[in-house]
């Protein structure tokens, strides 16, 4: 069954290469386990960037991924991707799966275009 | 009479606050004078950023505007806006007017969304 997932259409990474954006789903269900996957779309190909399962006890996710972090609250996940460079500019999709209790629900956002600009190196200090 | 003006939908300013993009029009006319105006749209309001008239002798424009520069070649103008900061992020429209010889033609592009990220200041050198 499907749920609706919303995410911002555009986000600018900071000059440190950090991009943060919310991923929300509706209708909101009383859910024990919510799996969130961030995918990057390049051409017709989707590659997984990071994924985590939020549970009633574990509301901080992506502990296995150095470049992703996220917090979960009700039906909203605040995602942060760091270590971004200009070559990482692209469309990042948020996929949400309600894993427990059944029934299984899944939804995919339309994607957030993340723009990344590489900073100029600072001049060497003499 | 109307001409079609095309410009890219999105451009990222460099970390130095410089954004460059082309503005092209068609059909191409053999024209002595082409006036190009860059406008910024905020909400429902348009404000002029800079304007110049290119002639057969004068293919470098915006000499009166410190933040704009541009070169003209046939039916294409290469625009550069500098000194941009994050607050300048927005939609920039290119307006083209074929001034001479008559008939008068005018066209407006759909706008280029320029994204600007302020760089982090470099640490003070001791």
């Amino acid at each position: 069954e499907a749920i609706q997932v919303t995410q911002p259409s555009v986000v600018l990474a900071s000059s440190h290469g950090v991009a943060s954006f919310p991923c929300e789903y509706s209708p909101s269900h009383n859910t024990d386990e919510v799996r969130v996957t961030v995918l990057r779309q390049t051409n017709d190909q989707m590659t997984e960037v990071c994924a985590t399962t939020f549970t009633e006890k574990n509301t901080v996710g992506f502990l296995d991924y150095p470049f992703c972090s996220g917090t979960f609250n009700e039906s909203r996940v605040n995602l942060t991707i760091q270590g971004l460079r200009a070559v990482d500019t692209g469309l990042y999709l948020c996929k949400v799966e309600l894993m427990y209790p059944p029934p299984y629900f899944v939804g995919m956002g339309n994607g957030t275009q993340i723009y990344v600009i590489d900073p100029e190196p600072c001049p060497d200090s003499d | 009479e109307a001409i079609q003006v095309t410009q890219p939908s999105v451009v990222l300013a460099s970390s130095h606050g410089v954004a460059s993009f082309p503005c092209e029009y068609s059909p191409s006319h053999n024209t002595d004078e082409v006036r190009v105006t860059v406008l910024r749209q905020t909400n429902d309001q348009m404000t002029e950023v800079c304007a110049t008239t290119f002639t057969e002798k004068n293919t470098v424009g915006f000499l009166d505007y410190p933040f704009c520069s541009g070169t003209f070649n046939e039916s294409r103008v290469n625009l550069t806006i500098q000194g941009l900061r994050a607050v300048d992020t927005g939609l920039y429209l290119c307006k083209v007017e074929l001034m001479y010889p008559p008939p008068y033609f005018v066209g407006m592009g759909n706008g280029t969304q320029i994204y600007v990220i302020d760089p982090e200041p470099c640490p003070d050198s001791d």
């Epitope: 009383n30 024990d32 386990e33 799996r35 994924a51 399962t53 549970t55 009633e56 006890k57 574990n58 799966e97 894993m99 427990y100 209790p101 059944p102 029934p103 299984y104 | -």
Partner: antibody, heavy 124, light 107 residues
Framework: EVQLVESGGGLVQPGGSLRLSCVAS????????MHWVRQAPGKGLEWVSA????????YYADSVKGRFTISRDNSKNTLYLQMNSLRAEDTAVYYC?????????????????WGQGTLVTVSS | DIQMTQSPSSLSASVGDRVTITCQAS??????LNWYQQKPGKAPKLLIY???NLETGVPSRFSGSGSGTDFTFTISSLQPEDIATYYC?????????FGQGTKVEIK
């Protein structure tokens, strides 16, 4: 060895109460959803109740809702089923079963470990 | 609730025979179906999960297939130790429901 051992069954009069226990060993108890499934004599299997790994969420079949309470004590690796207002139709062998691992990356649940069962007889 | 209908309710076959049991769901359950074996006086044992995946340690003569509403459980070559009752179970939604069981006997 992964094991579940139930206890607490017995003969009880209609309207009475009973508490079943299920002690788990050989796995991280708090990392699994746990279930109770029953089987009336000579009949098929009927799912009764489920509880999340932390005990924060509970689920019941309509036939027992409001009468039975599932709970767990993760410090004791023990699952419970408190049965009140018992009826003759609650007579069955009650099994505890291990369900889904919390945080599993795919949807789905199967009862891969079962206890030996404990018989509850409701009769006057 | 989702109804699970198994057929036949019982069957008798010879050692070495191919045995097939079907399970029909009252609505689409995708591949969210498990199969269990229960021997007399014992607890059920998981054989197949997610309609077609063999549980670790279960002999390869057991298999499952199907999706949607129609599912099949097969024993490719019946062995004496396979005498038991077999149940299908859906996990699409609570309450989880089981088929009424199929009793397999040796001729």
């Amino acid at each position: 060895e992964v094991q579940l051992v139930e206890s607490g069954g017995g003969l009880v009069q209609p309207g009475g109460s009973l508490r079943l226990s299920c002690v788990a060993s050989g796995f991280t108890f708090s990392s699994y959803y746990m279930h109770w499934v029953r089987q009336a004599p000579g009949k098929g299997l009927e799912w009764v109740s489920a509880i999340s790994g932390s005990g924060g969420s509970t689920y019941y079949a309509d036939s027992v809702k409001g009468r039975f309470t599932i709970s767990r004590d993760n410090s004791k690796n023990t699952l419970y089923l408190q049965m009140n207002s018992l009826r003759a139709e609650d007579t069955a062998v009650y099994y505890c079963a291990r369900g889904r691992q919390v945080g599993k990356s795919s949807f789905g649940e199967a009862f891969d470990v079962w206890g030996q069962g404990t018989l509850v007889t409701v009769s006057s | 609730d989702i109804q699970m209908t198994q057929s036949p309710s019982s069957l008798s076959a010879s050692v070495g025979d191919r045995v097939t049991i079907t399970c029909q769901a009252s609505q689409d359950i995708s591949n969210y179906l498990n199969w269990y074996q229960q021997k007399p006086g014992k607890a059920p044992k998981l054989l197949i999960y997610d309609a077609s995946n063999l549980e670790t340690g279960v002999p390869s003569r057991f298999s499952g297939s199907g999706s949607g509403t129609d599912f099949t459980f097969t024993i490719s070559s019946l062995q004496p130790e396979d005498i038991a009752t077999y149940y299908c179970q859906q996990f699409t939604s609570f309450p989880y429901t089981f088929g009424q069981g199929t009793k397999v006997e040796i001729k």
